[in-house]
């Protein structure tokens, strides 16, 4: 499955929108930094078959979409930017879903992939727990926004590697 060129442009747009969503000076939030334990090894793309990589990417985007679709998120961010961001993520999910269906037919996905998807889910559980513990404060959301920008950058890089493999 070849992800359309518009998909990588969508990735870039999503990152730009996320960068624009900041509302407060990041410098006031330094002490709120937190180790969310991003599962970097699931995004290095070396040990993966293409179907596995696509399903991990799908899970990453899906969890990001879920996180920014909550009521608490709506209260934290400027509505028009949040809607645009969600739309970009939704489009990426559609692209990836089409690929997942196509690729799973080509190659069997080993159980190892379930571990990778579980690692991504647990990562987002840690983010949600952090937000809850911090009572969804503006700084907590700033830290999460920075973290998601970083994790989406990893996703973008994995997609670039997948395209080079084609």
């Amino acid at each position: 499955c070849d992800l359309p060129q518009t998909h990588s442009l969508g990735n870039r747009r999503a990152l730009i929108l996320l960068a624009q969503m900041g509302r407060i000076s990041h410098f006031s939030c330094l002490k709120d930094r937190h180790d969310f334990g991003f599962p970097e090894e699931e995004f290095d793309g070396h040990q993966f078959q293409k179907a596995q990589a696509i399903s991990v990417l799908h899970e990453m985007i899906q969890q990001t979409f879920n996180l920014f679709s909550t009521e608490d998120s709506s209260a934290a961010w400027e509505q028009s930017l949040l809607e645009k961001f969600s739309t970009e993520l939704y489009q990426q999910l559609n692209d990836l879903e089409a690929c997942v269906i196509q690729e799973v037919g080509v190659e069997e996905t080993p159980l190892m992939n379930e571990d990778s998807i579980l690692a991504v889910r647990k990562y987002f559980q840690r983010i949600t727990l952090y937000l809850t513990e911090k009572k969804y404060s503006p700084c907590a959301w700033e830290v999460v926004r920075a973290e998601i920008m970083r994790s989406l950058s990893f996703s973008t890089n994995l997609q670039k590697r997948l395209r080079r493999k084609d």
Epitope: H26, L30, K31, R33, F36, V143, E147, R150, S153
Partner: antibody, heavy 121, light 107 residues
């Protein structure tokens, strides 16, 4: 390869203005903050201030607030430190270093080679 | 501002010695402490971040510990290339602040 390359040594007279630079390469420039650190001859490290190149937001140490200006041009991946009126006491080595911002990652993991500023009449 | 106090300000040691440098913060900084090594005429080099994480490429003889207000940098077996000045720095809040430095000299 991540690199921060600073502009060359400067010799200035008191009262003159100066702008030194720090060019980042090998990484996404807007994903990291750039901090500036002063080291006077034979002395320790002093943090001056920091900039987020993505939106040019800045924070300064109270000791340097109003004395220097930190800026950045993300289109050319460069941060700047400037003085409008230099004093002899500004004679020092100035370093830039990258900071991961609000991410849980090593602070000031890469440094520029330093710019020696000498202010003398 | 958070004050960072290092001790000792200088020490003399021999190759193979175990060396310990301490850093105390004027208020709790959790684990937001970094250690740097600087050699004459060179830029500082990050050794330890978040109190105990070893920076990539740094030899394992360097280790960091502590949290709250008291922190330690340990060199388990001093090597000739370790003679330098060491600085702690808090990254808990702005303004960021450094310790005054500890110079490790050859005995």
């Amino acid at each position: 390869e991540v690199q921060l390359v600073q502009s060359g040594a400067e010799v200035k007279k008191p009262g003159e203005s100066l702008k030194i630079s720090c060019k980042g390469s090998g990484y996404s420039f807007t994903s990291y903050w750039i901090g500036w650190v002063r080291q006077m001859p034979g002395k320790g490290l002093e943090w001056m201030g920091i900039i987020d190149p993505s939106d040019s937001d800045t924070a300064y140490s109270p000791s340097f607030q109003g004395q220097v200006t930190i800026s950045a041009d993300k289109s050319i991946s460069t941060a700047y430190l400037q003085w409008s009126s230099l004093k002899a006491s500004d004679t020092a080595m100035y370093y830039c270093a990258r900071h991961p911002g609000l991410n849980w990652a090593p602070d000031f993991d890469y440094w520029g080679q330093g710019t020696l500023v000498t202010v003398s009449s | 501002d958070i004050q960072m106090t290092q001790s000792p300000s200088s020490l003399s040691a021999s190759v193979g010695d175990r060396v310990t440098i301490t850093c105390r913060a004027s208020q709790s900084i959790d684990g937001s402490l970094n250690w740097y090594q600087q050699k004459p005429g060179k830029a500082p080099k990050l050794l330890i971040y978040f109190a105990s994480s070893l920076q990539s490429g740094v030899p394992s003889r360097f280790s960091g510990s502590g949290s709250g207000t008291d922190f330690t940098l340990t060199i388990s077996s001093l090597q000739p290339e370790d003679f330098a000045t060491y600085y702690c720095q808090q990254s808990y809040d702005f303004p960021l602040t450094f310790g005054q430095g500890t110079k490790v000299e050859i005995k």
